[in-house]
């Protein structure tokens, strides 16, 4: 089976078999090289080891056949080529993976066979409540997660001069309840923050792939204002 | 924006050569497969040459096989047709174009062309 | 090498109507379940556009009254309302095996 062996002349003795070492078919390898037995009927027996067609080929009547353009097969524990995943593409013959369209990514730990995602939309309808100096926000999951399941949420927060119209990072003494990144529920709380100041909170969507993607960060903004402490 | 600039057409004598260039730009050239495709006038399409991003895959028609010669490189996002032995019947437009990302492919963009024609 | 022939040659069709148009190949251009058939348009001067790949699949940006059916080695191509931009040379092309054989082009007028 995708092996070869030369022809050998049979032992004397009947009960003697043979070991005779074969070799793998072109385009096809092994982890245990392929051995048959010889008997002195001259009849092959007792197969060991197989041969597999490498990576970017497959098995087709015998013989390894290469992957066409559109399809790959990233090992050769794997038995046929398959379609690139969504969001990919190949144009070579022979792949053993294929590439992600633009826009879409690949983390090193994902498989080859799945899907390139993108980094999430934005959060949607982010609503806020002030209780003097603490800040409750919730919001709902963004419409596309980018074909992810490893959503989470980061909270940026910025303190803003009324006047002056410039904002600047909150700093330390803001605590947030869980935390402010990778968080998994839609809500939030921060507590400590100043009285009688003016804030912007950036809730931002981001994935397995969001630190792969130079596009602009998706988040939705929530303008407050804290109450006398 | 995805371009493709074809040049190096002009007038040549029958048996003579020309190497036409294709100028990518506005994706990643070297992941992408490209197509040369011809058209003599007034007639229709011929699909002349493809390779792909890597160079590892290369077809030609049966018309120019032995002839033509299909390359690219990636680090100048160029793609060439080296074209010797012309012949009368090569007179045409050449076009490059695109292998798509959506499966089962087409040829997605298409440059504006460039004339060969082949004529003592 | 795969032999595509187009029918017809050409027609005339008026504004809002159906047109059609067919494409025969030589032998199946289908592999694992995808047909490779591919459709283009081409005006006058203008390098080819791709309207439909895989026999039925919009490429983005065409209107949606191009449509493409068909498998094996028969297929359609449909504009549902004629609008007068639909005057062109229609071209079906596939892309199973290489040589990547066109059609000899359907030129569409509007009556």
């Known amino acids: 089976h995708l092996a070869v062996f030369p022809d050998t002349i049979t032992g004397a003795d009947s009960s003697q078999l043979l070991e005779v070492s074969g070799s793998c078919v072109n385009h096809s390898v092994t982890d245990e090289p392929p051995k048959m037995h010889c008997s002195a009927e001259g009849e092959w027996l007792v197969p060991i080891g197989k041969c597999m067609c490498k990576a970017g080929y497959e098995e087709k009547n015998g013989t390894c056949q290469v992957c066409r353009p559109g399809f790959f097969k990233a090992s050769p524990h794997i038995q046929s080529c398959g379609k690139c995943p969504p969001h990919s593409y190949t144009h070579e013959e022979a792949s053993t993976s294929c590439v992600c369209e633009k826009d879409y990514f690949r983390r090193e730990s994902d498989p080859p066979t799945m899907a390139c995602t993108r980094p999430p939309s934005a959060p949607r309808n982010a609503i806020s409540n002030v209780n003097e100096t603490s800040v409750f926000l919730e919001w709902i999951p963004p419409a596309d997660t980018g074909g992810r399941k490893d959503v989470s949420y980061y909270i940026a927060c910025k303190k803003c001069n009324s006047h002056a119209g410039v904002c600047e990072e909150c700093g330390g003494h803001v605590r947030y309840l869980p935390r402010q990144s990778g968080l998994k529920n839609t809500s939030v709380m921060m507590v400590d923050l100043l009285a009688h100041t003016n804030y912007t909170f950036e809730i931002e969507a981001v994935n397995g792939v969001s630190d792969l993607s130079p596009g602009a960060r998706q988040y939705v903004s929530v303008n407050v204002t804290t109450n006398q402490a | 924006e995805v371009q493709l600039v074809e040049s190096g057409g002009g007038l040549v004598q029958p048996g003579g050569s020309l190497k036409l260039s294709c100028a990518a730009s506005?994706?990643?050239?070297?992941?992408?497969?490209i197509h040369w495709v011809r058209q003599a006038p007034g007639k229709g399409l011929e699909w002349v040459a493809y390779?792909?991003?890597?160079?590892?895959?290369?077809y030609y028609a049966d018309s120019v096989k032995g002839r033509f010669t299909i390359s690219r490189d990636n680090s100048k996002n160029t793609l060439y047709l080296q074209m010797n032995s012309l012949r009368a019947e090569d007179t045409a437009v050449y076009y490059c174009?695109?292998?798509?990302?959506?499966?089962?492919?087409?040829?997605?963009?298409w440059g504006q062309g460039t004339l060969v024609t082949v004529s003592s | 090498d795969i032999v595509m022939t187009q029918s017809p040659d050409s027609l005339a069709v008026s504004l809002g109507e159906r047109a059609t148009i067919n494409c025969k190949a030589s032998?199946?251009?289908?592999?694992?379940?995808?047909?490779?058939m591919n459709w283009y348009q081409q005006k006058p001067g203008k390098a080819p556009k791709l309207l439909i790949y895989?026999?039925?699949n919009l490429e983005s940006g065409i209107p949606d009254r191009f449509s493409g059916s068909g498998s094996g080695t028969d297929f359609t191509l449909t504009i549902s309302r004629l609008e007068p931009e639909d005057a062109a040379v229609y071209y079906c092309?596939?892309?199973?095996?290489?040589?990547?054989?066109f059609g000899q082009g359907t030129k569409l007028e509007i009556k």
């Open positions: 174009a695109r292998y798509g990302t959506s499966f089962p492919y087409g040829l997605d963009y």
């Open positions: 506005g994706f990643t050239f070297s992941t992408f497969g």
């Open positions: 390779i792909s991003g890597a160079s590892t895959t290369i």
């Open positions: 032998q199946s251009v289908d592999y694992d379940g995808d047909s490779y």
């Open positions: 895989g026999a039925s």
């Open positions: 092309q596939q892309s199973n095996e290489d040589p990547f054989t």
